[in-house]
């Protein structure tokens, strides 16, 4: 005959652990049910009665199976230099990422805490390394034979046009000016446009809650008895 399935709460066998979606309650000394994502423990289990779970209130969430007494607060609304790539729901925190033309100067576990505008290379300088979600543009002076006449976070140094007869020689910030006859464009090595930085930001697929000590008040929430209930294993 198969072994009888134990219903929560139950005392685990010595040396064994509680099953998936259960936790060991130190006070009751029983294996008890965890609460599903979007819920939290409203009443803890006893030796004879199981955990009572309740839905997270507005603007709060739990992402994992848990036994936290309070849901976590969603982060504050995204600032004007950000876009909300994931809304606050009962099961997930809001994620804010930087809008196009900005990069994340101070990241957090998910999304960005502080965005900054991408550096624009002034005339005479071109983009050496393009901006990414988390790094700024790096500019470099245009080498002899190349120029950039724009203030841009995407334009690289381009080769001067080659004239049959030069009217005005090119410099780092200006193309050469030819007289009358059609110029030919030099194809100097590396003279390709760098791709535009990605404007739609990807989001992490496996988010984890920030520790309760993070400076953001959105995560400074009671985690209940140790070991931490949100973010525990056995999800």
């Amino acid at each position: 005959l198969p072994a009888q399935v134990a219903f929560t709460p139950y005392a685990p066998e010595p040396g064994s652990t509680c099953r998936l979606r259960e936790y060991y309650d130190q006070t009751a000394q029983m294996c008890c049910s965890k609460c599903s994502p979007g819920q939290h423990a409203k009443v803890f289990c006893t030796k004879t009665s199981d955990t009572v779970c309740d839905s997270c209130e507005d603007s709060t969430y739990t992402q994992l199976w848990n036994w936290v007494p309070e849901c976590l607060s969603c982060g504050s609304r995204c600032s004007s230099d950000q876009v909300e790539t994931q809304a606050c729901t009962r099961e997930q925190n809001r994620i804010c990422t930087c809008r196009p033309g900005w990069y994340c100067a101070l990241s957090k576990q998910e999304g960005c805490r502080l965005c900054a505008p991408l550096r624009k290379c002034r005339p005479g300088f071109g983009v050496a390394r393009p901006g990414t979600e988390t790094s700024d543009v790096v500019c470099k002076p245009c080498a002899p034979g190349t120029f950039s006449n724009t203030t841009s976070s995407t334009d690289i140094c381009r080769p001067h046009q080659i004239c049959n007869v030069v009217a005005i020689p090119g410099n780092a910030s200006m193309d050469a000016v030819c007289t009358s006859t059609s110029p030919t464009r030099s194809m100097a090595p590396g003279a390709v446009h760098l791709p535009q930085p990605v404007s739609t930001r990807s989001q992490h697929t496996q988010p984890t809650p920030e520790p309760s000590t993070a400076p953001s008040t959105s995560f400074l929430l009671p985690m209940g008895p140790s070991p931490p209930a949100e973010g525990s294993t056995g999800d």
């Epitope: 006070t27 423990a41 409203k42 009443v43 803890f44 009572v52 007494p69 309070e70 309760s212 000590t213 400074l220 929430l221 009671p222 985690m223 209940g224 008895p225 140790s226």
Partner: antibody, heavy 118, light 107 residues
Amino acid sequence: QVQLQQSGPELVKPGASVTISCKASDYSFTNYYIHWVKQRPGQGLEWIGWIYPGNVITKYHEKFKGKAILTADTSSTTAYMQLNSLTSEDSAVYFCARSRATGYFDYWGQGTTLTVSS
Amino acid sequence: DIQMTQTTSSLSASLGDRVTISCRASQDIRNYLNWFQQKPDGTIKLLIYYTSRLHSGVPSRFSGSGSGTDYSLTISNLEQEDMATYFCQQFNTLPWTFGGGTKLEIK
């Protein structure tokens, strides 16, 4: 045996501030909420707010925001409630109580009587 | 805020009696109701939580029941030490609120 030992009675003048303490013993102080409850003479009980000493998060009844400030010192396992700009309406017995989940208070302090009078 | 009403402010009963104290909420509190006992010296103890769960160390003569907005505390075999004031408290919605109390006296 879980104990919450509160500080003694206070007689203070209107406009002053007072701090009441609640010393916790025989349990893990950082794993439980400490609540504060007000009881006016001959009246019911009013929940003021809670503090979670594990990360010093607080939650207040809207009515007591600005009136009460809750703090906790984990090294001495003591919770404190400071009451500001006292008036005769603040004369009451104040209780601390602990809870594991936020809503039910399983052990209570003995109460601290506050009298506000000139 | 949710209002908690204990219509009987005081009642007297004899030792050995079965006593029921009632409490009504201004809206459905989904069984998130507790009962406390306050002795004449001011000390407060949790008796029942989540409508019917007996707190550890509380005698089994205390029991709780109810649902929705109506709840009750029953003391099945009244003893002298039960002379106290009994408060209900909801924890469905912040702020947590208490009833006005029912003072139980022994005849």
